[in-house]
Amino acid sequence: MAVTACQGLGFVVSLIGIAGIIAATCMDQWSTQDLYNNPVTAVFNYQGLWRSCVRESSGFTECRGYFTLLGLPAMLQAVRALMIVGIVLGAIGLLVSIFALKCIRIGSMEDSAKANMTLTSGIMFIVSGLCAIAGVSVFANMLVTNFWMSTANMYTGMGGMVQTVQTRYTFGAALFVGWVAGGLTLIGGVMMCIACRGLAPEETNYKAVSYHASGHSVAYKPGGFKASTGFGSNTKNKKIYDGGARTEDEVQSYPSKHDYV
């Protein structure tokens, strides 16, 4: 029950996280114009990964896409790539985790297969979350660097063909959405990995065998002694010896995994 709850909660948390990563990637407010000490008040600029928007004092808002690829900073391209990789991995993870959910029965899928799928989706969610956090952090670092460069340029002279950036940019809402969403996806992934441990029959059962002397000879069946990993065929404690040989399960209560022949 706890495993199902952990898996289900991990799935829901990851789902919210990935929805957040998608929302953040599409948002226009990755960076917003810093209004402090800025003499230009007629326009307010905010920018996303894909386009720049200007809201004018009249209330009119216009957005334009960054149609050039070569003219854009490599860091912006890297952030775009990280966010897209995060979304793709997250989406695949969600698809895998739907089939891995313990509460959903698909044909005669064994618990071992579900455990493997849960672990796979968990790892995908973790990587997805890390990609989003990394992408947002790289962008935030870029803004901080740009902010201080702009501040320095603001107080330099204007002799000759000065090319300074007088508009400073600060963190937009999308950065916070991205950080939270990445964190949720990461947490969801960890929960899926924890759930996987509970789904997989972990113990290695070594069948302890007791031999009882009997009147007739005991036929030993070669290859009968098997170590079950929990992923093999002998998970139901079947008798694998005939005659006077009986498994300890018939005599003792539950053997621990440290009981050897």
Epitope: S58, E62, R64, L143, N146, Q166
Partner: nanobody, 118 residues
């Protein structure tokens, strides 16, 4: 690369008028503002007037009601009509284009001297 060419500066009488023009050549990102800033010796640069690509206009407090900015988007040119000139209007006037492409970009002209004589 954007190049800005200013013209129209010079000597003007107290209460007189001058017309500055600034032509931008090169590829300019669609969202932008074009405008004028000035810097008197020993002073900080000061906003004179800007005209945005969307049609909004903003004037500096010291020139409101006296200066008029206009913009020709087809020619990528901005004009500053200065009237009722005062001695405190004496400064180097710089043409500026600020584009709102990724993290913004500023382009400045060489500056044109405006001197108001008594």
């Amino acid at each position: 690369q954007v190049q800005l060419v200013e013209s129209g500066g010079g000597l003007a009488q107290l209460g007189g008028s001058l017309r500055l023009s600034c032509a931008a050549s090169g590829s300019i990102f669609g969202l932008n503002f074009m405008g004028w800033w000035r810097q008197a010796p020993g002073s900080q640069r000061e906003l004179v007037a800007i005209a945005t690509s969307g049609g909004s206009i903003q004037y500096g407090d010291s020139v409101k009601g006296r200066f008029t900015i206009s913009r020709d988007n087809a020619k990528n040119t901005v004009y500053l009509q200065m009237a009722s000139l005062k001695p405190e209007d004496t400064a180097v006037y710089y043409c500026n284009v600020h584009t709102y492409d990724f993290l913004g970009r500023d382009y400045w002209g060489q500056g044109t001297q405006v001197t108001v004589s008594l």
